[in-house]
């Protein structure tokens, strides 16, 4: 039960995270005009990965796409790439994890296959989350660098009669959405990996049940004993101290449970 909950929760958290990564990637407010020096601007500038926008005090908003590919900064291209890789990996991870969910039965798919799929999707979510966090962090670093450069220009470049206002940009809402979404995807991925560890023993457990059910000489063993997972070299029975562990007696009492999981 705990494994199913962990897997389900991991899936939901990752789903929210990936939705957030997609939202962040599409958002226009990756960087917003810093209003510290000019709080009474009638024109508010903000920029995204795909276009830059202006919101006038008249209420009118206009956006212009970046219609060049070669003319864009390499860092911006890198951020775009990281976010897209994150989305693609996350989407594939979601697809894989749907079929890996214990609560969904697809033909005669064995639990070992589900465990592998859970692990695969978990790793995909972790990489997806890391891509998003990396992308957002690279953009944030770019903003900080540009901010201080433009601040220096603002106070040193005033020789001459005409002052040219430089628009300084600061962190936009998309950065925070991206960081949170990346974190959630990462957490979801870790949860899926944890769930995978719990899925494999139950698969072996299930086989043990079908073997013992035919005989009548099974002794009652108190405590939560389970057969070895087969992943380690130790093939002896180990006591598993987790809240979700069942005795072999319990497992035998309800073999029908596994037919519907």
């Amino acid at each position: 039960m705990a494994v199913t909950a962990c897997q389900g929760l991991g899936f939901v958290v990752s789903l929210i995270g990936i939705a957030g990564i997609i939202a962040a990637t599409c958002m226009d407010q990756w960087s917003t005009q810093d209003l510290y020096n000019n709080p009474v601007t009638a024109v508010f500038n903000y920029q995204g990965l795909w276009r830059s926008c202006v919101r006038e005090s008249s209420g009118f908003t206009e956006c212009r796409g970046y219609f060049t590919l070669l003319g864009l900064p390499a860092m911006l291209q890198a951020v775009r790439a990281l976010m897209i890789v994150g989305i693609v990996l996350g989407a594939i991870g979601l697809l894989v994890s749907i079929f890996a969910l214990k609560c969904i039965r697809i033909g005669s798919m064995e639990d070992s296959a589900k465990a592998n799929m859970t692990l695969t999707s978990g790793i995909m979510f972790i990489v997806s989350g890391l891509c998003a966090i990396a992308g957002v962090s690279v953009f944030a670093n770019m903003l900080v660098t540009n901010f201080w450069m433009s601040t220096a220009n603002m106070y040193t470049g005033m020789g001459g009669m005409v002052q040219t206002v430089q628009t300084r940009y600061t962190f936009g809402a998309a950065l925070f959405v991206g960081w949170v979404a990346g974190g959630l995807t990462l957490i979801g991925g870790v949860m899926m990996c944890i769930a995978c560890r719990g899925l494999a023993p139950e698969e072996t457990n299930y086989k043990a049940v079908s073997y013992h059910a035919s005989g009548h000489s099974v002794a009652y063993k108190p405590g939560g004993f389970k057969a070895s997972t087969g992943f380690g070299s130790n093939t002896k029975n180990k006591k598993i101290y987790d809240g979700g562990a069942r005795t072999e007696d319990e497992v035998q009492s309800y073999p029908s449970k596994h037919d519907y999981v």
Epitope: S52, C53, V54, E56, S57, S58, G59, F60, Q163, V165
Partner: antibody, heavy 117, light 113 residues
Framework: EVQLVESGGGLVQPGGSLRLSCAGS????????MSWVRQAPGKGLEWVSS???????YYLDSVKGRFTISRDNAKNTLYLQMSSLRAEDTAVYYC???????????WGQGTLVTVSS | DIVMTQSPDSLAVSLGERATINCKSS????????????LTWYQQKPGQPPKKLIY???TRESGVPDRFSGSGSGTDFTLTISSLQAEDLAVYYC?????????FGQGTKLEIK
């Protein structure tokens, strides 16, 4: 046809108060940013105040604390409450709609405010 | 505050001739977000309210004759009337729309020579 009609102007003594109104027809004032602009006799144009979405207001430094821009959505009317009036506030006051490029595209005919003792 | 300086203060041009009015801003009016210049040109005839001619420095308002054109970027702007007509006798104002206060130039009076 869009029309803006100002009213409430007149002669007032220094230190006195006046409330100017701008009634809109063919236009819903609440959906647009609106401004007040004044023109002293024989002089140029001077922006006075603006109200934008969310009720955010902006004022010329010389009128800050003395003038208040507001609107009544139900009456489709823009107001400029003027207090502590000075001789230099004497002007024709226009209300105007702010549109693309923050430009003022529709203007009223104006109302004359004379501050004199 | 942004200071808008128009030149000349008055201009006398013959009918059918080209008239050019300049406007200089103390700060750049170019928005990095949409690459538009936040400058508007108005025409004010005696006894009338101002009328918007050009916005975004070069976009002509609908209904405005195509003899009126705006140009320039950053801090230097120009209003050009390609072939002056009698009805163009008026005072012309430029206005900064980037920062509050939304400042106007002092105006240029256009007269018929």
């Amino acid at each position: 046809e869009v029309q803006l009609v100002e009213s409430g102007g007149g002669l007032v003594q220094p230190g006195g108060s006046l409330r100017l109104s701008c009634a809109g027809s063919g236009i819903t004032l609440s959906t647009y940013a609106m401004s007040w602009v004044r023109q002293a006799p024989g002089k140029g144009l001077e922006w006075v105040s603006s109200i934008i979405s969310g009720g955010i207001t902006y004022y010329l430094d010389s009128v800050k604390g003395r003038f208040t821009i507001s609107r009544d959505n139900a009456k489709n009317t823009l107001y400029l409450q003027m207090s502590s009036l000075r001789a230099e506030d004497t002007a024709v006051y226009y209300c105007a709609r702010k549109y693309h490029g923050n430009a003022l595209d529709y203007w009223g005919q104006g109302t004359l405010v004379t501050v004199s003792s | 505050d942004i200071v808008m300086t128009q030149s000349p203060d008055s201009l006398a041009v013959s009918l059918g001739e080209r008239a050019t009015i300049n406007c200089k801003s103390s700060q750049s009016l170019l928005s990095s977000g949409n690459q538009r210049n936040y400058l508007t040109w108005y025409q004010q005839k005696p006894g009338q309210p101002p009328k918007k001619l050009i916005y975004w420095a070069s976009t002509r308002e609908s209904g405005v004759p195509d003899r009126f054109s705006g140009s320039g970027s950053g801090t230097d702007f120009t209003l050009t009337i390609s072939s002056l007509q009698a009805e163009d006798l008026a005072v012309y104002y430029c206005q900064s729309n980037y920062f509050y206060p939304l400042t106007f130039g002092q105006g240029t009076k256009l007269e018929i020579k």
